[in-house]
Interface confidence: medium
């Protein structure tokens, strides 16, 4: 069956300054393939993290993803800005052998809304 | 305080169709998602669909896609459920359902109309 | 689809009694599980949310718990208001949003 990917929440509202999770489940690690989060959608969408050892400032993985078996791939952003605010996706990719990876599946997003502290 | 007005129900031959509409009061109608959920007599519930705050986000159950149509008019406070080719099985309260503004669960409901499908 | 599945499906109890009612999901919900009340007549109110988190006004005799696939809703002295049809229902996954069948907790 096909990987299924999920994002709970609608949205979330965080106060500037503090930090928010973005939960995301997936119900399989096949096809062999990364996980990135993205914010915003089409030529605009920003990469904010991927679960494939880079270091991104602010952002953490939730849970131990090195762990087999693991399907949780929620984030955590640390000292949230407005410009954090928008739409945040979790999409799983398939591996590309000589070709890029493939997208295959996204999560329905999740709005952050910031709050003035 | 929040409301919600089911109106449009009745008595409806198969393969007819029937309109029912919700009128919100008490929130920021725009704002929220909202769903039609109904409950077949002697059933238990059974969501039918949704559709987001602006109108971008549509979602039907198998059961009822191709035949219903959801909408929703910001400007009047009103939720839509155009229901076309009416079967027997259709015969149901139907309730208009507020979503929380975070999760996919219902805070508010309408008291519901009731649809009776038959010949 | 996520199904539900509600047990049993009547409960016959007097007042003052402690109700137990049971959800089991067909797949992991974590802890997006509502529970509603349903008399006849009236629309379904929300009890609970996030499996264990009680909804505006209702009375601390709800309590409900579980996670993953497993979810209980108690009633700890069941009073004459609190006989009716109670549901479940899951929001983890995107729609289809699911409901289980319902328990009818009813006056023995």
């Known amino acids: 069956t096909e990987v299924k990917v999920t994002q709970p929440e609608k949205s979330v509202s965080v106060a500037a300054g503090d930090s928010t999770i973005l939960n995301c489940t997936v119900t399989s690690l096949l096809p062999v393939g990364p996980i990135r989060w993205y914010r915003g959608v089409g030529q605009s969408r920003l990469l904010i993290y991927s679960f494939t050892g880079e270091h991104f400032p602010r952002i953490r993985n939730v849970s131990d993803t090195t762990k087999r078996n693991n399907m949780d791939f929620s984030i955590r952003i640390s000292n949230v800005t407005p410009e954090d605010a928008g739409t945040y996706y979790c999409v799983k990719f398939q591996r590309g052998s000589s070709e890029p990876d493939t997208e295959i599946q996204s999560g329905g997003g999740t709005e952050v809304y910031v709050l003035a502290k | 305080e929040v409301q919600l007005v089911e109106s449009g129900g009745g008595v409806v031959q198969p393969g007819r169709s029937l309109r029912l509409s919700c009128a919100a009061s008490?929130?920021?109608?725009?704002?929220?998602?909202v769903n039609w959920v109904r409950q077949a007599p002697g059933k238990g519930l059974e969501w039918v669909s949704l559709?987001?705050?602006?109108?971008?986000?549509?979602y039907y159950a198998d059961s009822v896609k191709g035949r219903f149509t959801i909408s929703r008019d910001n400007s009047k406070n009103t939720l839509y459920l155009q229901m076309n080719s009416l079967r027997a099985e259709d015969t149901a309260v139907y309730y208009c359902a507020k979503e929380n503004n975070r999760y996919r669960f219902f805070d508010d409901w309408g008291q519901g109309t009731l649809v009776t499908v038959s010949s | 689809e996520i199904v539900l599945t509600q047990s049993p499906g009547t409960l016959s109890l007097s007042p003052g009694e402690r109700a137990t009612l049971s959800c089991r999901a067909s797949q992991s919900v974590y802890t997006y599980l509502a529970w509603y009340q349903e008399k006849p007549g009236q629309a379904p109110r929300l009890l609970i949310y996030?499996?264990?988190s009680r909804a505006t006004g209702i009375p601390d005799r709800f309590s409900g718990s579980g996670s993953g696939t497993e979810f209980t809703l108690t009633i700890s002295s069941l009073q004459s208001e609190d006989f009716a049809v109670y549901y479940c229902?899951?929001?983890?996954?995107?729609?289809?949003?699911?409901f289980g069948g319902g328990t009818k907790v009813e006056i023995k």
């Open positions: 996030g499996a264990s």
């Open positions: 008490g929130f920021t109608f725009s704002s929220y998602d």
């Open positions: 229902q899951q929001y983890y996954d995107r729609p289809p949003l699911t």
């Open positions: 559709i987001s705050g602006s109108g971008e986000i549509i």
